[in-house]
């Protein structure tokens, strides 16, 4: 910390002088500053065997200022403290100690963790993630047509990364199986197998999850009512089978 020192006025006699230079209000040749101008701190500086009074604009590192009507003094911070406002309020601890609410601690209290960069005890921060974004379109090898079994994906963002002792982030990507939209591929996006292109268009109301796999379409002799019942049964089975597969990087 910058401390501007009041220079001592050298005089022939060790008596008190009012003609002091710098920050001294009163001084003597032998003892240096005896008192300081307003807003300056009085401190004793050892020079050899002698202690000299000096006036400082702020207390040196490791000391704090105390105000009294007649004098402002510099007092040493606690032994484990580097800088402080007073003995009970440390602002920077000595090496090996962690600062918490103005105190220097060997170890951080329960529920807090040591930040070895700032040398402070900080709150444990747990991971926070956003809501899931909507599922992506169902695709198979990048195609959204044909009647194949494909996959759909959804993602969520990390809002708050965890601290060292915080809970890890849950998966941020999720993938599950689905059936690609039941529509014919256009010329440029055709599937490889010819039989996929011969299938009929689905009814407008059919959702991708309700689409049965190719085997159920082979029983074309059934009357429409029977076929519809079987499709509903198949839909339930497909939904039951759709267990989500999670893929994630641990953060």
């Amino acid at each position: 910390q910058n401390a501007s020192r009041g220079r001592r006025q050298r005089r022939m006699h060790p008596n008190v002088s009012q003609g002091c230079q710098g920050g001294c209000a009163t001084c003597s040749d032998y003892n240096g500053c005896l008192s300081c101008k307003p807003r300056l701190f009085f401190a004793l500086e050892r020079i050899g065997m002698k202690q000299i009074g000096v006036c400082l604009s702020s207390c040196p590192s490791g000391y704090y200022g105390t105000r009294y009507p007649d004098i402002n003094k510099c007092t040493k911070c606690k032994a484990d403290c580097d800088t402080c406002f007073n003995k009970n309020f440390c602002t920077k601890c000595k090496s090996g100690f962690y600062l918490h609410l103005g105190k220097c601690l060997d170890n951080c209290p329960e529920g807090l963790e040591a930040n070895n960069h700032t040398m402070e005890c900080v709150s444990i921060v747990h991971c926070e993630v956003s809501e899931w974004n909507p599922w992506s379109p169902c695709t198979k090898k990048g195609k959204t047509c044909g009647f194949k079994r494909g996959t759909e994906t959804r993602v969520r963002e990390i809002i708050q990364h965890p601290s060292a002792k915080g809970n890890l982030c849950p998966p941020t990507n999720e993938t599950r199986k689905c059936t690609v939209q039941r529509k014919k591929c256009q010329k440029g996006e055709r599937g490889k197998k010819g039989r996929e292109r011969k299938r009929k268009k689905p009814n407008k109301g059919e959702s991708k999850e309700a689409i049965p796999d190719s085997k159920s379409l082979e029983s074309s002799k059934e009357i429409p009512e029977q076929r519809e019942n079987k499709q509903q049964q198949k839909k339930r089975k497909v939904q039951d089978k759709q267990k989500s597969v999670s893929v994630s990087t641990v953060h």
Partner: antibody
Framework: QVQLVQSGAEVKKPGASVKVSCKAS????????FHWVRQAPGQGLEWIGY????????GYNQKFKNRVTMTRDTSTSTAYMELSRLRSEDTAVYYC??????????WGQGTTLTVSS | DIQMTQSPSSLSASVGDRVTITCKAS??????????MNWYQQKPGKAPKLLIY???NLESGVPSRFSGSGSGTDFTLTISPVQAEDFATYYC?????????FGAGTKLELK
């Protein structure tokens, strides 16, 4: 004489950030710690934190720890306080003050912050 | 945190009266023989102004009708005799521990 002059009033939307400045004159800027205190309308005073202008070390009230940043520019004798992720409860007058031997002896005129959507 | 409880929250007085405001800390604000207690005066639309530091010391330029006393957890600010310019809000503040805390204030009004 010691003077602390703060930046003008601010109106911000919730979620935004604000940076208030406090320019010091009349003394050696690095001699005293700068503190920031706020006062919500019709309420009492609340301490936010401090910065040592000599080395930039700062410390914050736990209540604001994750949202406040205090900096200084010794070349212009100016201290700054930035508050992020603003909410309506942050509507207040923000004061800077010099801290001399455990008391706030000089204060800025205050900066009014209004947070409203 | 050290809680500072000021009482009363408001009081009415006439010019020439003697008024006493009290501040009670939830724990001692003394250390090494020093009391880390300050008193401030604030007028509407203005910044606070330091009146008393270290419990009982009058800040330079503050009239001697203001006085402070107390130690440990119990402190008082006395104004005697009250002058017209003293009608304002008064706050106590402890600087012994992190975080620094203020009382809720006492509003001195003209009777």
């Amino acid at each position: 004489q010691v003077q602390l002059v703060q930046s003008g009033a601010e109106v911000k939307k919730p979620g935004a950030s604000v940076k208030v400045s406090c320019k010091a004159s009349g003394y050696t800027f690095t001699s005293y710690t700068f503190h920031w205190v706020r006062q919500a309308p019709g309420q009492g005073l609340e301490w936010i934190g401090y910065i040592y202008p000599s080395n930039g070390d700062s410390g914050y009230n736990q209540k604001f720890k994750n949202r406040v940043t205090m900096t200084r520019d010794t070349s212009t004798s100016t201290a700054y306080m930035e508050l992020s992720r603003l909410r309506s409860e942050d509507t207040a007058v923000y004061y800077c003050a010099t801290y001399f031997a455990n008391n706030f002896d000089y204060w800025g005129q205050g900066t009014t912050l209004t947070v409203s959507s | 945190d050290i809680q500072m409880t000021q009482s009363p929250s408001s009081l009415s007085a006439s010019v020439g009266d003697r008024v006493t405001i009290t501040c009670k800390a939830s724990q001692s604000v003394d250390y090494d023989g020093d009391s880390y207690m300050n008193w401030y005066q604030q007028k509407p639309g203005k910044a606070p102004k330091l009146l008393i530091y270290a419990a009982s010391n009058l800040e330079s330029g503050v009239p001697s009708r203001f006085s402070g006393s107390g130690s440990g957890t119990d402190f008082t600010l006395t104004i005697s005799p009250v002058q017209a310019e003293d009608f304002a809000t008064y706050y106590c503040q402890q600087s012994n521990e992190d975080p620094l805390t203020f009382g809720a204030g006492t509003k001195l009004e003209l009777k």
